[in-house]
């Protein structure tokens, strides 16, 4: 069964700057990744970035840099200035659309006890939705 993992880290240098990393553990071909915050995409969440493996990347403030880390994982840096900046308990979600598995989404937030610069290991987060 495919799984999605989400890792959220607060940068030590900028306490209101976050890095979100997401990955897909499955054998299928990824066709699209959508990163949102405030809840799952399409369920109250606001899209931060959409990444297509070949067509390109679209991102919106406060996202600063979205990129593919590998063929099955992505990272997104959020800059934390202004009213739309994230806070420590913000939920971030990643939805991977893949063939033939369908869509798989997981969410994560900053670990409650984490110090700046530290992060939880990138273990698979609970899968919230699987649209097959």
């Amino acid at each position: 069964t495919p799984e999605v993992w989400v890792q959220v880290r607060m940068e030590a240098t900028e306490l209101s700057s976050f890095t979100i990393r997401c990955g897909f553990l499955g054998s299928g071909s990824i066709s699209l990744v959508t990163v949102s915050w405030g809840g799952p995409n399409g369920a109250g969440g606001t899209t931060l970035a959409v990444l297509h493996p070949e067509r390109g990347i679209r991102q919106w403030a406060p996202a600063r840099q979205a990129r593919w880390e590998t063929q099955s994982s992505i990272s997104l840096i959020l800059e934390g200035s202004g009213a739309s900046s994230p806070c420590a308990n913000t939920t971030f979600c990643c939805k991977f659309a893949s063939f033939p598995e369908g869509s798989w989404e997981a969410c994560g937030s900053l670990p409650p006890s984490s110090d700046p610069g530290l992060s939880a290991p990138p273990t698979p987060a609970p899968i919230l939705r699987a649209d097959l």
Epitope: T46, P53, E54, R55, R58
Partner: antibody, heavy 114, light 113 residues
């Protein structure tokens, strides 16, 4: 198949504003950004910016910041581009596009002339 | 901004012959993480909007004839039409799909010799 249908041609005076609409059908309007691109007569393509209709998040080409505004109405699947302080150099065909420029509207000719 | 430069500006090729258009970017369009090049090619005929032909430097958009092919990596890319047809007369544009703002080449006008 996504279809984008734009509003008709406009003739405007210098200093005025123009608002171009782009109605989408056949796809998920709020999931992908609507891009705006213009093409002056006999010239190349120039990206103006984009809006993500679901959240109204926008990105603008620095060249147009302060003069262009994007809005979107998800109830009618329509995106809008308003360009203000028009000058003769803004005479161009304005296109909306979606899904990484895979789908395009037919274009709207905006002529700025005194 | 990434500057896209196409060559030649215009090109005349006989029907059935090969047409080659080059595109050079001022910065690499290669995403090192997934080894994909974010470059697209468009065809525009008079009075029509551009039509996406190629994305990811080499992937043909659905419905595009297989005589169109894209190649290249990093900063140097090529669009090839293997056997020119009359309906291929148009202006062709390359586009940076790697970073904001998306920028286009100046265009290459393709005509029949």
């Amino acid at each position: 198949e996504v279809q984008l249908v734009q509003s008709g041609a406009e003739v405007k005076k210098p200093g005025s504003s123009v608002k171009v609409s782009c109605k989408a059908s056949g796809g998920t309007f709020s999931s992908f950004s609507i891009e705006w691109v213009r093409q002056a007569p006999g010239q190349g393509l120039e990206w103006i910016g984009e809006i993500l209709p679901g959240s109204n998040s926008t990105n603008y080409n620095e060249k147009f910041k302060g003069r262009v505004t994007f809005t979107a109405d998800t109830s009618t699947n329509t995106a809008y581009m308003e360009l203000s302080s028009l000058r003769s150099e803004d005479t161009a065909v304005y296109y909306c596009s979606s899904y990484w420029f895979a789908y395009w509207g037919q274009g709207t000719l905006v002529t700025v002339s005194s | 901004d990434i500057v896209m430069t196409q060559s030649p500006d215009s090109l005349a090729v006989s029907l059935g012959e090969r047409a080659t258009i080059n595109c050079k970017s001022s910065q690499s369009l290669l995403n090192s993480g997934n080894q994909k090049n974010y470059l697209a090619w468009y065809q525009q005929k008079p009075g029509q909007p551009p039509k996406l032909l190629i994305y990811g430097a080499s992937t043909r958009e659905s419905g595009v004839p297989d005589r169109f092919s894209g190649s290249g990596s990093g900063t140097d890319f090529t669009l090839t039409i293997s056997s020119l047809q009359a309906e291929d007369v148009a202006v062709y544009y390359c586009q940076n799909a790697h970073s904001y703002p998306p920028t286009f080449g100046q265009g290459t006008k393709l005509e029949i010799k």
